[in-house]
């Protein structure tokens, strides 16, 4: 539902690379939308060499994208699905995930989300936009702005907690994941550490806290002693294959 915030999210998964494409290099000028620097999506949509990114569900795409068949706006029935650019305000939609951050799908149209639509504690549009890539994007119209982020901080591999654009910016054993205020380098999860499986298919929360993926030889699985727990509270941890 709209009233759920995806907080604990293994949004950064071991996904295949974009079809025929590679990510940009640290230190390069990259066109990005504020608040939408995510791994595993079509990261650099504004670049000429953009390649589609295959997906099975919305959560495998960046927060400025949704998963769908390229030939139709809704989720396709069968066939290859890819991450498509989110729909801006006043554009047609069929579910919340289709609308860009700060908007939600109402009566088939992407509408701006104000505080009455979100519970207390959910991150607001202005913060998700402002904190994403450190550009003042609090535009009067509320649209996520495309801006160019050219930063000298990516020349050396980021240590734990330092800001990043993508996992290649981080030192070994770290991945790039959102941590409330920014995207930072976080440790890849070890055996026994809590991870999160995406279960939601149609809902789309604002991902304000992401965990890294499980380390090599580990998989995110339900903890054995939590099998009896209710679906909503089942705990997943990184476990040996």
């Amino acid at each position: 539902t709209l009233n759920s915030v995806l907080i604990n999210s293994n949004a950064i998964k071991n996904l295949p690379p974009p079809l025929g494409g590679a990510g940009g290099q640290p230190g390069s000028a990259v066109s990005v939308a504020p608040g939408v620097l995510y791994e595993g999506g079509n990261k650099y949509q504004t670049l000429d060499n953009y390649q589609p990114y295959p997906c099975a569900e919305d959560e495998e795409c960046g927060s400025d994208e949704y998963c769908s068949s390229p030939s139709r706006g809704a989720a396709g029935v069968g066939g290859v699905q890819i991450c498509l650019a989110c729909r801006k305000r006043r554009k047609r939609c069929m579910r919340h995930a289709m609308c860009c951050p700060g908007n939600y799908c109402k009566n088939g149209i992407c509408m701006p989300s104000d505080h009455s639509h979100f519970p207390r504690g959910e991150i607001e549009e202005s913060i998700i936009e402002n904190l994403g890539n450190d550009h003042n994007a609090a535009a009067g119209d509320g649209y996520p702005r495309r801006t160019t982020l050219t930063s000298k901080i990516y020349h050396t591999k980021g240590q734990e907690g330092s800001v990043c654009l993508r996992s290649s910016d981080c030192a070994a054993g770290l991945c790039c994941a959102r941590h409330f205020w920014s995207k930072i380098c976080k440790p890849v999860l070890k055996e026994g550490q809590v991870c999160t499986k995406h279960k939601r298919k149609g809902s789309h929360g604002l991902e304000i806290f992401q965990r890294c993926y499980c380390g090599e030889g580990l998989a995110c699985r339900i903890q054995k002693d939590h099998h009896q727990a209710s679906n909503s509270s089942r705990l997943h941890t990184c476990q040996r294959h």
Epitope: V5, N8, G121, D134, G161, S162, V163
Partner: antibody
Amino acid sequence: QVQLVESGGGLVQPGGSLRLSCAASGFTFSSYWMSWVRQAPGKGLEWVSGISYSGSNTHYADSVKGRFTISRDNSKNTLYLQMNSLRAEDTAVYYCARMGIDLDYWGQGTLVTVSS
Amino acid sequence: DIALTQPASVSGSPGQSITISCTGTSSDVGGFNYVSWYQQHPGKAPKLMIHDGSNRPSGVSNRFSGSKSGNTASLTISGLQAEDEADYYCQTWDSLSFFVFGGGTKLTVLG
């Protein structure tokens, strides 16, 4: 190793101003968000303000909004907190802290006393 | 405003295990699943002990562990030692307030 050293605290009259500094070393200062957190005598911790790595985004607790200004000088590896219109309830030890994975490194703090 | 409730004080003998609770609401602790714990010795700066509910930063003893059930997060210290005597603060995150701290718990190691 990571080091944060605050300075600039002292005794000031209500309505007065003070500027705190935090000198950072042992890490790439310009790659981290930074925060100020305060602790009134015998009380708990209260987050005061945060600033993004380049300084273009700043955020404040309601209790200090409009009176305090956070800033940074990445060329000097220094974080600042300009405090204006000080009140008795602003009396506290002020810590600067690195916003890594949460507040992962803290300075030793500087005491600000607001009293007439 | 978000408020995190901690017991004012907890005590235990060396070698024992103690647990400090931190109770919030479904809007913060319960909904976010994200709680951190800090240790503060008298006259010293706070130190991050647990993040993301149960993860220890490097250098923190494995005697410290965190967990969460419903709207309550817990910090457990096993094999209590004299140097564990300190104030402990839980912290969660709020989109308006950034860092929200509990009122703190004074841990006394007896004997």
